[in-house]
Amino acid sequence: QGIVGSLPEVLQAPVGSSILVQCHYRLQDVKAQKVWCRFLPEGCQPLVSSAVDRRAPAGRRTFLTDLGGGLLQVEMVTLQEEDAGEYGCMVDGARGPQILHRVSLNILPPEEEEETHKIGSLAENAFSDPAGSANPLEPSQDEKSIP
């Protein structure tokens, strides 16, 4: 997909909201394990996987559904400020672990000060671009693997 395709999708979400992310995988990986993980300095920490886990905590806030036909859906509910960060759909397929889709999640505060709103014009407190710090020389998605 090239350099542009390897940048994460940027998503802003309010505190307390839910997000839905869809990830596409190759049909030959239909039986492979899929994982939704959070990128940390030490690697990608799995949050939920397509493997049946009967020990999943009752208070779990992340859900992964394999819709079939090469489509995976991830839902994160009741988002909190500490959920901000970078996430990814991974598949442990025939070619080894692959990143399917990356999301840079920013959490919006519960209410914003009215004076920051410049209706119909550029606001002074423009959000910084989370994707702007991405390494432009990083490999394409097909070349990536779980650290």
Epitope: E9, V10, L11, Q12, L20, Q22, S121, L122, A123, F127
Partner: nanobody
Framework: QVQLVESGGGLVQTGGSLRLSCAAS????????MGWYRQTPRKSREAVAT???????SYIDAVKGRFTISRDNAKNTLYLQMNSLEPEDTAVYYC???????WGQGTQVTVSS
């Protein structure tokens, strides 16, 4: 000219539907995360639904299952399909681009009981 222009608001009865549109110009729309906010006289402005530059979405609980946010990058347009509307949905609805940080002028949605 850099601007967001909303349309589609109006008066509707409880249980009815409306589709809001937001036409963007002067920005790299396909690269921008976008959102719909609403504000009533008694509440601060709140984000209702947002969408990433590749289609991932978020919804607040109050509208989940009733509202659907979508985008058409070919038309530089953001949409909010609002179904099963309730009087509590009455508000001015604003379109927002997050990068650059840009707001529309708003469109009034009134749901009568």
């Amino acid at each position: 000219q850099v601007q967001l222009v909303e349309s589609g608001g109006g008066l509707v009865q409880t249980g009815g539907s409306l589709r809001l549109s937001c036409a963007a110009s002067g920005i790299s729309f396909s690269d921008a995360a976008m959102g719909w906010y609403r504000q009533t006289p008694r509440k601060s402005r709140e984000a209702v639904a947002t969408i990433g530059n590749r289609g991932s979405v978020s919804y607040i609980d109050a509208v989940k299952g009733r509202f659907t946010i979508s985008r058409d990058n070919a038309k530089n347009t953001l949409y909010l399909q609002m179904n099963s509307l309730e009087p509590e949905d009455t508000a001015v609805y604003y379109c927002r681009s997050f990068q650059p940080d840009l707001w529309g002028q708003g469109t009034q949605v009134t749901v009568s009981s």
